[in-house]
C-alpha cells in the first residue's frame, strides 16, 4: 500500500510534470511565436485511455517527436532548450510509471495537434493530482 510519503512524492512529481508541460504550451501559444502555424501541422498520437500512472507510457513514446517539433522554435537565446525540458519530463515520467510492469500503450484512432496533445496530458496530471489531495 502506498505510504503518505510516497503519495506526497508522487504528487510533487506530477506537479513538476504539469508545470513543465504548461510551460511548453505557454511558449507555443505565445502570440509572438512565428513558428506556431508550422508546429500545428505536426500530428501526435493520443492515448485511448489515460487514467492511471502506467498510461504515461503513451506520453513517453511521444517525447522524441515533441522535442523535434519544439526545435522548430530555433530561438537564438534559449533559457532552457527543448532537450532540457524533454529530458526532465522523461525522468519524471520514468519515475512515475515505474519499470516493474511493461504496459503496451493503446492509441486513439484520431491524431492531435501539439496543443491538443499537451492539453490532454495537462488534464491527465491535474486529474491524478486531484485524486491524491
Amino acid at each position: 500500500a502506498p505510504t503518505s510519503s510516497s503519495t506526497k512524492k508522487t504528487q510533487l512529481q506530477l506537479e513538476h510534470l504539469l508545470l513543465d508541460l504548461q510551460m511548453i504550451l505557454n511558449g507555443i501559444n505565445n502570440y509572438k511565436n512565428p513558428k506556431l502555424t508550422r508546429m500545428l501541422t505536426f500530428k501526435f498520437y493520443m492515448p485511448k485511455k489515460a487514467t492511471e500512472l502506467k498510461h504515461l507510457q503513451c506520453l513517453e513514446e511521444e517525447l522524441k517527436p515533441l522535442e523535434e517539433v519544439l526545435n522548430l522554435a530555433q530561438s537564438k537565446n534559449f533559457h532552457l532548450r527543448p532537450r532540457d525540458l524533454i529530458s526532465n519530463i522523461n525522468v519524471i515520467v520514468l519515475e512515475l510509471k515505474g519499470s516493474e510492469t511493461t504496459f503496451m500503450c493503446e492509441y486513439a484512432d484520431e491524431t492531435a495537434t501539439i496543443v491538443e496533445f499537451l492539453n490532454r496530458w495537462i488534464t491527465f496530471c491535474q486529474s491524478i493530482i486531484s485524486t491524491l489531495t
Epitope: L17, M23, K76, D84, I89
Partner: nanobody, 119 residues
C-alpha cells in the same frame, strides 16, 4: 511587474565557493523560468544556468560540474551554488525571471551582483 533581489556575491580565492540567491516578488506566475546570466567586462551577457518551476535545468558548458542551480518554488527563490571558482568566473551575475523557456521582451532582470575570483 516582477522585482528581483540578488545576494551572495563577493570576493573569493580561486578554488573557493559562493552561493548566490535571488528572490522574486510581484506579479509571479507559477509557471516560469528563473536563472543566472553573467557579464564580464568587455564581454556579452551569457547564460550561466537556468531552471524551470518544473525542475528542468540548463547549464553553460563552462560551469557544468562546478555550479548547481536550484530553486524553492514556495519562496519564488533561485539559488546558484558555485564551487571550484576560477578567475574566469569573475563577472557581474544577473538574476533572470521569464515566463517562457526562450528569451523575449517580457523577461525581467535583477540589478546584478559582483563576483570576483582573485588570489
Amino acid at each position: 511587474e516582477v522585482q528581483l533581489v540578488e545576494s551572495g556575491g563577493g570576493l573569493v580565492q580561486p578554488g573557493g565557493s559562493l552561493r548566490l540567491s535571488c528572490a522574486a516578488s510581484g506579479s509571479i506566475f507559477s509557471i516560469n523560468v528563473m536563472g543566472w546570466y553573467r557579464q564580464a567586462p568587455g564581454k556579452q551577457r551569457e547564460l550561466v544556468a537556468a531552471i524551470s518551476s518544473g525542475g528542468s535545468t540548463n547549464y553553460a558548458d563552462s560551469v557544468k560540474g562546478r555550479f548547481t542551480i536550484s530553486r524553492d518554488n514556495a519562496k519564488n527563490t533561485v539559488y546558484l551554488q558555485m564551487n571550484s571558482l576560477k578567475p574566469e568566473d569573475t563577472a557581474v551575475y544577473y538574476c533572470m525571471y521569464a515566463s517562457s523557456w526562450y528569451e523575449d521582451e517580457t523577461d525581467y532582470w535583477g540589478q546584478g551582483t559582483q563576483v570576483t575570483v582573485s588570489g
